[in-house]
Interface confidence: medium
């Protein structure tokens, strides 16, 4: 009976040993699979993250396009309304002009002497830009970049004057240090009577004959409202 029990124990040990080996093999297999699954999950996660990022970028880009489209549509519908109506109000900016804070701005890409630039703007029923705030200064500066550009400020008849009658003394100023200096040392005859934005945006007085770029500005009429989008 004892030998029978020993035989059974041997059998059980063998079975258990097989079971252990088999279980170990399965655990090993599972851990390998687990590693694969983990890697796969990581890969899927990063793919998902990339897709989300792409989607987010596409969404932002689409939003910009939609915004631009709405703006263009509003501008076009406004101009259509202006053409169809017979009122004398200027309710929206013309094509190629930039609207900002109820004014329209046009930025030249060529150069003219100050008087010619002034004349050009007047022939657009507008005037050389008149800067009335730091906010407007930043807006204009952003559009012209680091390029000498005429503005609607001069002292050709004595005191400094804005072309639209805005008071110079009490108004916004952004001169470079030690400017205006009415410098005579340029050898071109006379002093410096016309103001321009310099490469850093601050103002300088210069010889009015220099062929600088310029900015025209015209105000939208006070009573005007944005037309509904059709």
């Amino acid at each position: 009976q004892n030998s029978q029990l020993q035989e059974e124990l041997r059998g059980l040990r063998e079975t258990f040993s097989n079971f252990t080996a088999s279980t170990e093999a399965q655990v090993k297999g599972l851990s390998t699979q687990g590693g694969n699954v983990g890697r796969k999950m990581k890969s899927l996660e990063s793919q998902l993250e990339k897709q989300q990022k792409d989607l987010s970028e596409d969404h932002s880009s689409l939003l910009l396009h939609v915004k631009q489209f709405v703006s263009d549509l509003r501008s076009l519908s406004c101009q259509m309304a202006a053409l169809q109506g017979n009122g004398s109000e200027r309710t929206c900016c013309p094509v190629n002009w930039v609207e900002h804070e109820r004014s329209c701005y046009w930025f030249s890409r060529s150069g003219k002497a100050w008087a010619d630039a002034d004349n050009y703007c007047r022939l657009e029923d507008a005037h050389l830009v008149v800067v009335t705030s730091w906010e407007e200064q930043k807006f204009v500066q952003h559009h012209i970049g680091p390029v000498n550009t005429w503005m609607g400020l001069h002292d050709q008849n004595g005191p400094w004057k804005w072309v639209d009658g805005t008071d110079y003394e009490t108004g916004f100023k952004n001169w470079r240090p030690e400017q205006p200096d009415d410098w005579y040392g340029h050898g071109l005859g006379g002093g410096e009577d016309c103001a321009h934005f310099t490469d850093d945006g601050r103002w300088n007085d210069d010889v009015c004959q220099r062929p600088y770029r310029w900015v025209c500005e015209t105000e939208l009429d006070k009573a005007s409202q944005e037309p509904p989008l059709l």
Epitope: A82, L83, Q84, G85, N86, G87, S88, R90, P94, V95, N96, W97, W106, S110, K112, D116, N119, Y120, R122, L123, E124, D125
Partner: antibody, heavy 122, light 107 residues
Framework: EVQLVQSGAEVKKPGSSVKVSCKAS????????INWVRQAPGQGLEWMGE????????FYAQKFQGRVTITADKSTSTAYMELSSLRSEDTAVYYC???????????????WGQGTTVTVSS | DIQMTQSPSSLSASVGDRVTITCRIS??????LAWYQQKPGKAPKLLIY???NLAEGVPSRFSGSGSGTDFTLTISSLQPEDFATYYC?????????FGQGTKLEIK
């Protein structure tokens, strides 16, 4: 349809004044500049000046400065050109013309009136 | 003021000919130039604006070229109705000067 219709022919004495009208129709009068151009017999075209009816801003050629006055009546969509101190050399056909596209970098005269003959003779 | 020199002042040509009229400007006016056609007793008619753009309703045999100081009006194949006087005009500040004109006559 855009149309510019001018007043009829005039015969004037030297030293007097003439006022020519130009009635616009078919578009928003205040949205475009109106220009005046003259042409003496057998001669070329000569620009005289411009008005923006929206703002009443005017521009005149140096040659006519002080003798010419351009005005606009928004209520009747009519532009006027008055030339004073007339001389025999002012005998010409006077045209009004719409300046196409009030804005942007390139302009042009896209519509013209039929012309008004002004004869200055004693 | 800007000076305009249009040439030739007169020109004889036949139906079917290719004709070129030039306009030279005293300073750079970029593309701010228009061309007009005028027939006797009539108001001028816009042909080309902004140097190269064909005005509405103008036949495609008319074309404009150039920028800066030198501009050209070309008629590729003259038609009987094209015999008239042609003018260039600049729009680079006032005065909006016209060229002296080119009279195109039948040979």
């Amino acid at each position: 349809e855009v149309q510019l219709v001018q007043s009829g022919a005039e015969v004037k004495k030297p030293g007097s004044s003439v006022k020519v009208s130009c009635k616009a129709s078919g578009y928003t009068f205040t949205a475009y500049g109106i220009n005046w151009v003259r042409q003496a017999p057998g001669q070329g075209l000569e620009w005289m000046g411009e008005i923006f009816p929206r703002s009443d801003n005017t521009f005149y050629a140096q040659k006519f400065q002080g003798r010419v006055t351009i005005t606009a009546d928004k209520s009747t969509s009519t532009a006027y050109m008055e030339l004073s101190s007339l001389r025999s050399e002012d005998t010409a056909v006077y045209y009004c013309a719409r300046k196409g596209r009030e804005y942007g970098t390139s302009h042009y005269f896209d519509y013209w009136g039929q012309g008004t003959t002004v004869t200055v003779s004693s | 003021d800007i000076q305009m020199t249009q040439s030739p002042s007169s020109l004889s040509a036949s139906v079917g000919d290719r004709v070129t009229i030039t306009c030279r400007i005293s300073e750079n006016i970029y593309s701010n130039l228009a061309w007009y056609q005028q027939k006797p007793g009539k108001a001028p008619k816009l042909l080309i604006y902004a140097a190269i753009n064909l005005a509405e309703g103008v036949p495609s045999r008319f074309s404009g070229s150039g920028s800066g100081t030198d501009f050209t009006l070309t008629i590729s194949s003259l038609q009987p109705e094209d015999f008239a006087t042609y003018y260039c005009q600049h729009f680079w500040g006032t005065p909006f000067t016209f060229g002296q004109g080119t009279k195109l006559e039948i040979k």
